[in-house]
């Protein structure tokens, strides 16, 4: 159940896909990855106001309980709903290999 | 890759399963659910310090970039890794039915 996609906080403030440019050094990968030298990392950032992109029933419950007990129950959180695969050229004991990672780049986002 | 399960912030402070008691009224379910009257809602609450219960490569990236750009990139977030099913006795147009929900109660937690 992907609930409302309208952000009541204003354009771009709610949970959505952002791109952050990061070097191998930024990611702590310089010692085991050869390429790419820089990654356009897609990640989920933004607020999750009431029922915005609620991933499931659990997210709806969390919203209700956060409204009641904000100090105890946190609001839902903006996380990846799915991922885009990515390859890395990585160092091995004997040389290099091309490895695919399925859980590295966010493809779309929801609140949970 | 479920990384370290040791919480550097002290016992119980990091991402883990919590139980919150909630009534049908608390949940906004009173108009469509008959039973149970009260639910022991299990949810994921707590901090996600560096590499604690990192769900995947994306969570590890998020940790690294949060350390570099804390104002831009949020820390990973504590969310359900899996769910326990739950049945609800709910009202229907013609009476009641027993419905199973697979995404209602968190079973265990990770950081993403």
């Amino acid at each position: 159940a992907r609930n409302g996609d309208h952000c009541p906080l204003g354009p771009g403030r709610c949970c959505r896909l952002h791109t952050v440019r990061a070097s191998l050094e930024d990611l702590g990968w310089a010692d085991w990855v050869l390429s790419p030298r820089e990654v356009q990392v897609t990640m989920c950032i933004g607020a999750c106001p009431s029922q915005f992109r609620a991933a499931n029933m659990h997210a709806q419950i969390k919203t209700s309980l956060h409204r009641l007990k904000p100090d105890t129950v946190p609001a839902p959180c903006c996380v990846p709903a799915s991922y885009n695969p990515m390859v890395l050229i990585q160092k091995t004991d004997t040389g290099v290999s091309l490895q695919t990672y399925d859980d590295l780049l966010a493809k779309d986002c929801h609140c949970i | 890759a479920r990384n370290g399960d040791h919480c550097p912030l002290g016992p119980g402070r990091c991402c883990r399963l919590h139980t919150v008691r909630a009534s049908l009224e608390d949940l906004g379910w009173a108009d469509w659910v008959l039973s149970p009257r009260e639910v022991q809602v299990t949810m994921c609450i707590g901090a996600c310090p560096s590499q604690f219960r990192a769900a995947n490569m994306h969570a590890q990236i998020k940790t690294s970039l949060h350390r570099l750009k804390p104002d831009t990139v949020p820390a990973p977030c504590c969310v359900p890794a899996s769910y326990n099913p739950m049945v609800l006795i709910q009202k229907t147009d013609t009476g009641v039915s027993l419905q199973t929900y697979d995404d209602l109660l968190a079973k265990d937690c990770h950081c993403i």
């Epitope: 050869l34 390429s35 790419p36 356009q40 885009n84 695969p85 990515m86 390859v87 890395l88 050229i89 290099v96 091309l98 695919t100 590295l104 780049l105 | -």
Partner: antibody, heavy 118, light 107 residues
């Protein structure tokens, strides 16, 4: 496993055009960092890189041949196409496609032969 | 475009010999040179990436070195299946360019 298969070769008239297909399996062209390139080899000669296309649809071409080449992809069909216009005798060659991961060309097809002759 | 000049263009050698091929780039390409092996009627096979890194499954008798403009490819002890044509290729910038090839043949 990764396989690539070129097709579309054969006899082409000078001044005509050729359209080659590269169908592949074992990888996806929607994966970040993946591309498909075309390389050719004239009879008894060395290798000449022609063009490549990336997962994000960025395209690069051999400088000398750029005006005659078009490269495109159909991600859902796992196919990449190379079109060459205004062909001449010196375009006679075996045309290979290769899988690319950034600047690695690690898997190659077996090639398709193009002969330009009247 | 960056020119890649390989030498020698051919060499005759025997099983067990050490073989060295050189490749010179027309401008600095850092370590961005790959090496390929091609047998008659077959597609090239990828051997070495970024001057010195053997690709997955490539035997350790194959090695590479160099940076800037001068690169070397070595087969430490030639095996019967190593008789082939070897190409260097710069992957520093597009258009990617190959050397003209070195044919390693039986003496």
């Amino acid at each position: 496993q990764v396989t690539l298969l070129e097709s579309g070769g054969g006899l082409v008239q000078p001044g005509g055009s050729l359209r080659l297909s590269c169908s592949f399996s074992g990888f996806s062209l929607s994966t970040y960092g993946i591309g498909v390139g075309w390389i050719r080899q004239a009879p008894g000669k060395g290798l000449e890189w022609l063009a490549h296309i990336w997962w994000n649809n960025n395209k690069y071409f051999n400088t000398a041949l750029k005006s005659r080449l078009t490269i495109s992809k159909d991600t859902s069909k796992n196919t990449v196409y190379l079109q060459m216009n205004s062909v001449r005798a010196e375009d006679t060659a075996v045309y290979y496609c290769a899988r690319m991961g950034y600047d690695i060309m690690d898997y190659w097809g077996q090639g398709t032969t193009v002969t330009v002759s009247s | 475009d960056i020119q890649m000049t390989q030498s020698p263009s051919s060499l005759s050698t025997s099983v067990g010999d050490r073989v060295t091929i050189t490749c010179k780039a027309s401008q600095d390409v850092n370590t961005a040179v790959a090496w390929y092996q091609q047998k008659p009627g077959k597609a090239p096979k990828f051997l070495i990436y970024s001057s010195s890194y053997r690709y997955t499954g490539v035997p350790d008798r194959f090695s590479g070195s160099g940076s800037g403009t001068d690169f070397t490819f070595t087969i430490s002890s030639l095996q019967p299946e190593d008789f082939a044509v070897y190409y260097c290729q710069q992957h520093y910038s597009t258009p990617w360019t190959f050397g003209q090839g070195t044919k390693v043949e039986i003496k």
